[in-house]
């Protein structure tokens, strides 16, 4: 009686169980009553990462520099190429199929968390007493200058984008 199911690493074809091709190889011809499954190694730019019956190997992933990608790990006949983001860029998702430059925090905002290869810059509004007058992916909010410690007085109040302006104390004659 012909089989209805096959063992692991086998597949059913023409009422018989054939061996799957091992990772790194593709199927050339199915087995017969008299011959084994015929498999061929994938070429240098291709891979197959599972026991399979694929007639074509998969092309290695291209780490497209136009998408900010670079090779982290070169592919083999059994593994795909792994891409990562170029310096100064981060992935647009966990799968990292493209990268974008880190966002800068605008004036009035400071960097709460510096970007990594997988996460963007996190900005926070500068609270009262702090300011940022630059657009930056690295700078935190800076505290207003303390005029008192310099024996000066506040001539112009600070904002979230500007420092206080200090000036000399009015002398009583």
């Amino acid at each position: 009686e012909p089989p209805t199911a096959c063992r692991e690493k086998q597949y059913l074809i023409n009422s018989q169980c054939c061996s799957l091709c091992q990772p790194g190889q593709k199927l050339v011809s199915d087995c017969t009553e008299f011959t084994e499954t015929e498999c061929l190694p994938c070429s240098e730019s291709e891979f197959l990462d599972t026991w399979n019956r694929e007639t074509r190997c998969h092309q290695h992933k291209y780490c497209d520099p136009n998408l900010g990608l670079q090779v982290q790990q070169k592919g083999t006949s059994e593994t795909d190429t792994i891409c990562t983001c170029e310096e100064g860029l981060h992935c647009t998702s966990e799968s990292c199929e493209s990268c974008v430059p880190h966002r800068s925090c605008l004036p009035g905002f400071g960097v709460k968390q510096i970007a990594t290869g997988v996460s963007d810059t996190i900005c926070e509004p500068c609270p009262v007493g702090f300011f940022s007058n630059v657009s930056s992916a690295f700078e935190k909010c800076r505290p207003w200058t303390s005029c008192e410690t310099k024996d000066l007085v506040v001539q112009q109040a600070g904002t979230n984008k500007t420092d206080v302006v200090c000036g000399p104390q009015d002398r009583q004659r």
Epitope: D49, R56, H58, Q59, K61, N66, L67, G68, D80, T92, S93, E94, S95, E97, S98, V100, P101, H102, R103, D120
Partner: antibody, heavy 116, light 108 residues
Framework: EVTVKESGPVLVKPTETLTLTCTVS????????VSWIRQPPGKALEWLGG???????YYASWAKSRLTISRDTNLKQVVLTMTNMDPVDTATYYC??????????WGQGTLVTVSS | AFQLTQSPSSLSASVGDRVTITCQAS??????LAWYQQKPGKPPKLLIV???NLASGVPSRFSGSGSGTDFTLTISSLQPEDFATYYC??????????FGGGTKVEIK
Amino acid sequence: EVTVKESGPVLVKPTETLTLTCTVSGFSLSSYGVSWIRQPPGKALEWLGGIGSDGSAYYASWAKSRLTISRDTNLKQVVLTMTNMDPVDTATYYCARGGITVYAMWGQGTLVTVSS
Amino acid sequence: AFQLTQSPSSLSASVGDRVTITCQASQSISTGLAWYQQKPGKPPKLLIVGASNLASGVPSRFSGSGSGTDFTLTISSLQPEDFATYYCQSYFSSSSTVFGGGTKVEIK
């Protein structure tokens, strides 16, 4: 050759659930994500959602409650399920290679009409 | 919700004209923007990635520029095969993956 191809019903009744399948060849779903994009007749493209190469699913905020995207890496298929279909959902539905990224490889699209 | 606003929605031009299409994001998307060309009955074709990088096989008369919230697609000298609809698409993150409303370039 790298290809993606949509298949599923061409006609769906209002309130019914739409199930579309994207079958891929020439690449592994463990290496690339797949997204679904639709286009109502004479209107703009709308990104519905996608599934990353790591299996993470992403959805457009307006479609989250109605959409499910899943995959079978062995069958090389990505499945879109959209509940509570309405005539305004009449559109050409495309699958494209890529998750949260750009889409260089598209299927030919399948026109789904929602009508009683 | 995040939005991409494309303008104009349509334009008429002649062969040889310089054509400019703009796309504005409702929040900064750095350079996470792509441009596509679509002809009737066909899927879109990728033209520009990363706001300014030409996709493979795309003629050099197409160019893209911009960063943050304001982006531009320029066709330096319009050819007969360029009459089509053009879309921008952001891909900065999953919450900002959307397409613009499209710009139809018609023959004057």
